[in-house]
Amino acid sequence: GIAIPRNSGCPNSEDKNFPRTVMVNLNIHNRNTSTNPKRSSDYYNRSTSPWNLHRNEDPERYPSVIWEAKCRHLGCVKADGNVDYHMNSVPIQQEILVLRREPRHCPNSFRLEKILVSVGCTCVTPIVHHVA
Amino acid sequence: GIAIPRNSGCPNSEDKNFPRTVMVNLNIHNRNTSTNPKRSSDYYNRSTSPWNLHRNEDPERYPSVIWEAKCRHLGCVKADGNVDYHMNSVPIQQEILVLRREPRHCPNSFRLEKILVSVGCTCVTPIVHHVA
């Protein structure tokens, strides 16, 4: 973690586990009030590298539901709807933080976990031609 | 949260803030050992909807550094390198969880926060509105 001077108003941290274990308020603050999250909801269908969304559920994780993108095609889709063999559909992956119940089934104790999720797909050229 | 019967081995939750406040172990467990996260690192350059990555830093947040994708073009890049304005480069966005220090500057007290980040870009067919 980042070393930040502690305010006198901070919760007490005299704990043998500190700074490994911290208190987290689960009342989620959503910063996206001005953004409509459905904005990109149809891109998965309109993309030249379209994808399907698969539900990944795990009650031992917070959030328990994560949506995983799977590219529909190996190639990209041309204007006429047919495959372009010269281009590839690939997943765009991102590492995200989730909370994992630890010990298992405990409602108020978690461990931070990094997982790699596929968010959507993009169309790429398979070979980069290096010019001497 | 999900109502899960508490194990006898769980940390005590007799706290007036529970279930709003939980204990989180910040020793991150990384589930991506078998996946090489560099696999998709050059897609941003090879995509028909290429993007730049901008560093967003906030010491009051965990993780403090988040990379935001910004599409380079409004249109998509054709095989000859020129931009096709009949297609659109659009950001693929995802809501992610971060930890926000609360109260500010406190090293061991956080609130869960949802933020919307752009992970990469994809090339889509624009929506054509037909006038009756």
Partner: antibody
């Protein structure tokens, strides 16, 4: 049971033409990508042509481009390979193969092959 | 074109042995690799796609893995019926290309 049966191979003189066919059964032909792959006498495998499920996309490697044409008749569950300006290096066993998806990237079912010999 | 190199054209192994067949791609192919088995007089048979996904009906003693541009096909506890030639194929960049094959003989 998926079956692919090739026919049309034979002995042809250099510069000649020949048409190979592959009849498919046991699956919905019109929803699968198909390919022709050949195996040379030294047992090397080489892609010859790809065609997607509806015939809207095709691909040929440089070695056969302009000389070979792949087509399909979904109503008759048949894949074709029209070959012209044949060369001795086209001598091979020709297999038709199915992709498990729409397009033709890798091959989960192969026919037993038909032999083409180009020789004077 | 992407070159697929199977460095061992053939080798002889004993029943029950563990065998590793390797295939090296000249460029990154991002796991778009298939493995085939071919027995004399027969057409190739798909074993693995996506570098690691075992096809339905293929015995679990076959497995695939990747390290960078190097791909491997492992056969655990070799059986008599595994005597064959094994080919890799990339499907990342057209034209799809095959390795030269590795012939497995039982001692």
């Amino acid at each position: 049971e998926v079956q692919l049966v090739e026919s049309g191979g034979g002995l042809v003189q250099p510069g000649g033409s020949l048409k190979l066919s592959c009849v498919a059964s046991g699956f919905t032909f019109s929803t699968y990508g198909m390919s022709w792959v050949r195996q040379t006498p030294d047992k090397r495998l080489e892609l010859v042509a790809i065609i997607n499920h509806n015939g809207g996309s095709t691909f040929y490697p440089d070695s056969v481009k302009g000389r070979f044409t792949v087509s399909r008749d979904n109503a008759k569950n048949t894949l074709h390979l029209q070959m012209s300006s044949l060369k001795s290096e086209d001598t091979a066993m020709y297999y038709c193969a199915r992709d498990p998806r729409h397009d033709g990237y890798f091959f989960d079912y192969w026919g037993q092959g038909t032999t083409l010999t180009v020789s004077s | 074109d992407i070159q697929m190199t199977q460095s061992s054209p053939s080798f002889s192994v004993s029943l029950g042995d563990r065998v590793t067949i390797t295939c090296k791609a000249s460029e990154d192919i991002y796991d778009r690799l298939a493995w085939y088995q071919q027995k004399p007089g027969n057409a190739p048979r798909l074993l693995i796609s996506g570098a690691t996904s075992l096809e339905t009906g293929i015995p679990s003693r076959f497995s695939g893995s990747r390290s960078g541009k190097d791909y491997t096909l492992d056969i655990n506890s070799l059986q008599t019926e595994d005597a064959a030639t094994y080919y890799c194929q990339q499907y990342w960049s057209v034209p799809w290309t095959f390795g030269g094959g590795t012939k497995l003989e039982i001692k």
